[in-house]
C-alpha cells in the first residue's frame, strides 16, 4: 500500500468517525427537541425551569438535529463507501452552510443598527401583546427566558411593562412586571422566585397548556426586580461573551473548512486510486 493510499484511507476513516460523532450528536439534539415537543410537562419538571421557551426551542432543536444528521450521514456513507456523489453533496452542503455563516456575519456587522431596530420592534410588540392570546405564548415565553437569564426587565426599562393591562394592579398599585423580572438573589432566598411563580400558577406544567389571564404571574415593580433594561443587558452580555462567540464561530468555521477540504481531497483522489487498481486487474 502506497503512502497516498494509506493517507486516503486515513482521511476516509477520519471523516467517517467524525461524521458518525456528529450524526449521534444530531440524533440526540433531534430526540431532545421531539421530547420537549411531545412531553413538555415532564421536561419542565426535569429541567426545573418554568418558562423555558419550549415551543420555539423544541422546533429549533428538532430541525437542527435533522440538519446535522443529514449532513453527517452524507459524510459517513460517502467516506466509507467512497461514493463521489455523496461526498460532493456533503461538500456542497458544508459550503452552503459556511457561505450562510459568512453572509450572516457580514450582515450582522454591517446592518447592526437595522437589526437592533428590528429586534426592538419585535420585543416591544411582544411586550404590548403580552398575555392577550393564550394560544400564542412562544414569543412571551422566550422573552421571559431572556429577562430571567440576562437579569434584566423590559427593553429600555422595567417601565415598558406598565402599559400591559393584564399585568396592571388596581389604582395606586398599578405598576407591575412579569415574574421573570423578579430578582430572587436580592432577597437572600433563591426559592422565592419558584414559590412566587408556582404558587400563582399552581401547576408545574402550566406552560404546556394554554394560559388565561388569571395565570399571568406579576410582581410589584417597586420590589426586588431587575432595574436594567434588556437592551443594555444584551449589550453587556454580547460585550462580555464576544471572545467566546467569535471563538465558537471561528472554530465551527474552521471545522467546516477542514471537513470540506478533506471531502474534496478524498473525492478528487478516489479516481486516481481506482485508475491504479484497474491497471493491476
Amino acid at each position: 500500500m502506497s503512502a497516498q493510499e494509506s493517507c486516503l484511507s486515513l482521511i476516509k476513516y477520519f471523516l467517517f468517525v467524525f461524521n458518525l460523532f456528529f450524526f449521534v450528536l444530531g440524533s440526540l439534539i433531534f430526540c431532545f427537541g421531539i421530547w420537549i415537543l411531545i412531553d413538555k410537562t415532564s421536561f419542565v419538571s426535569f429541567v426545573g425551569l418554568a418558562f423555558v421557551p419550549l415551543q420555539i426551542w423544541s422546533k429549533v432543536l428538532a430541525i437542527s438535529g435533522i440538519f446535522t444528521m443529514g449532513i453527517a450521514l452524507l459524510g459517513c456513507v460517502g467516506a466509507l463507501k467512497e461514493l463521489r456523489c455523496l461526498l460532493g453533496l456533503y461538500f456542497g452542503m458544508l459550503l452552503l452552510l459556511f457561505a450562510t455563516q459568512i453572509t450572516l456575519g457580514i450582515l450582522i456587522s454591517t446592518q447592526r443598527a437595522q437589526l437592533e431596530r428590528s429586534l426592538r420592534d419585535v420585543v416591544e410588540k411582544t411586550i404590548q401583546k403580552y398575555g392577550t392570546n393564550p394560544e400564542e405564548t412562544a414569543a412571551e415565553e422566550s422573552w421571559d427566558y431572556v429577562q430571567f437569564q440576562l437579569r434584566c426587565c423590559g427593553w429600555h426599562y422595567p417601565q415598558d411593562w406598565f402599559q400591559v393591562l393584564i399585568l396592571r394592579g388596581n389604582g395606586s398599585e398599578a405598576h407591575r412586571v412579569p415574574c421573570s423580572c423578579y430578582n430572587s438573589t436580592a432577597t437572600n432566598d433563591s426559592t422565592v422566585f419558584d414559590k412566587l411563580f408556582f404558587s400563582q400558577l399552581s401547576r408545574l406544567g402550566h406552560l404546556a397548556r394554554s394560559r388565561h389571564s388569571a395565570d399571568i404571574c406579576a410582581v410589584p415593580a417597586e420590589s426586588h426586580i431587575y432595574r436594567e433594561g434588556c437592551a443594555q443587558g444584551l449589550q453587556k452580555w454580547l460585550h462580555n461573551n464576544l471572545i467566546s462567540i467569535v471563538g465558537i464561530c471561528l472554530g465551527v468555521g474552521l471545522l467546516e473548512l477542514g471537513f470540506m477540504t478533506l471531502s474534496i481531497f478524498l473525492c478528487r483522489n478516489l479516481d486516481h486510486v481506482y485508475n491504479r487498481l484497474a491497471r493491476y486487474r
Epitope: Q159, D160, F162, Q163, R168, H175, E222
Partner: antibody, heavy 115, light 107 residues
Framework: QVQVKESGPGLVAPSQSLSITCTVS????????VSWVRQPPGKGLEWLGV???????NYHSALKSRLSIKKDHSKSQVFLKLNSLQTDDTATYYC?????????WGQGTLVTVSA | DIQMTQSPASLSVSVGETVTITCRAS??????LAWYQQKQGKSPQLLVN???NLADGVPSRFSGSGSGTQYSLKINSLQSEDFGTYYC?????????FGGGTKLEIK
C-alpha cells in the same frame, strides 16, 4: 392604613448637611419604593430621588453628587441626606410612598437654609 | 433629563365647566405619567398614573389621556373642591421630573 411622616431640623446653616427622617407605617419597605420631593416656597415640585424595595436608588441628576437616600427596615424609616446646602435648597421636603407615581405623601417638613 | 412643559400656567373657570390641562414631554415617555392635585398649604394628591389609570378614591369626573409626548388631564363639571394647582410627573428612564404646574382658580 398607609402613613408617612417627615421630621427635619427646620433651620440649617449654609454649607452644612441636611438630614431628614421619614417614618412609615401601613406598608412594607421591602415591596414599596419611597420617594423624596421638595417644593421651594411659592414654586413647583422638584423630584429628588427614590429608594426601591431592594435598596437600590435613583437620584436627580443635578443633585446626585450631594444627595444620598438610605433606609432601615427594622425601624420602618427612610433617611435623606443633602450635603453642602445653599440658600436655594430652602423648601418643604416631602417623602412619599411609591417609586413611580407617588400615592401617599407626608405633610412635609419646611427646611430653611440661612445663616 | 426629560423636560415636562405644562399648559396653561393658570386658568380661571367657573364651577360646572369642563377643563383640560395639557402636559408635553421633551421625548417619548411611553405613558409613564402621573397627575397630582395640590391645594394651598397641603401635600399633593395622586389623581392618575400610567397616563389613564385613576388612583384609588379619585372621582370619575377626572380622566387622563395621551401617549408618546402629549398628555392631558380632563375635569368634567368642576366642583369647588377641584380648585388648586395640578402637576404632571413623568417616570420614564431613571430620573423623574414634574411639570411647572397649572393653577386652577375660581372665576
Amino acid at each position: 392604613q398607609v402613613q408617612v411622616k417627615e421630621s427635619g431640623p427646620g433651620l440649617v446653616a449654609p454649607s452644612q448637611s441636611l438630614s431628614i427622617t421619614c417614618t412609615v407605617s401601613g406598608f412594607s419597605l421591602t415591596t414599596s419604593g419611597v420617594s423624596w420631593v421638595r417644593q421651594p416656597p411659592g414654586k413647583g415640585l422638584e423630584w429628588l430621588g427614590v429608594i426601591w424595595g431592594d435598596g437600590s436608588t435613583n437620584y436627580h441628576s443635578a443633585l446626585k453628587s450631594r444627595l444620598s437616600i438610605k433606609k432601615d427596615h427594622s425601624k420602618s424609616q427612610v433617611f435623606l441626606k443633602l450635603n453642602s446646602l445653599q440658600t436655594d435648597d430652602t423648601a418643604t421636603y416631602y417623602c412619599a410612598k411609591g417609586g413611580y407615581s407617588l400615592a401617599h405623601w407626608g405633610q412635609g417638613t419646611l427646611v430653611t437654609v440661612s445663616a | 433629563d426629560i423636560q415636562m412643559t405644562q399648559s396653561p400656567a393658570s386658568l380661571s373657570v367657573s364651577v360646572g365647566e369642563t377643563v383640560t390641562i395639557t402636559c408635553r414631554a421633551s421625548e417619548n415617555i411611553r405613558s409613564n405619567l402621573a397627575w397630582y392635585q395640590q391645594k394651598q398649604g397641603k401635600s399633593p394628591q395622586l389623581l392618575v398614573n400610567v397616563a389613564t389609570n385613576l388612583a384609588d378614591g379619585v372621582p370619575s369626573r377626572f380622566s387622563g389621556s395621551g401617549s408618546g409626548t402629549q398628555y392631558s388631564l380632563k375635569i368634567n363639571s368642576l366642583q369647588s373642591e377641584d380648585f388648586g394647582t395640578y402637576y404632571c410627573q413623568h417616570y420614564w428612564g431613571t430620573t423623574w421630573t414634574f411639570g411647572g404646574g397649572t393653577k386652577l382658580e375660581i372665576k
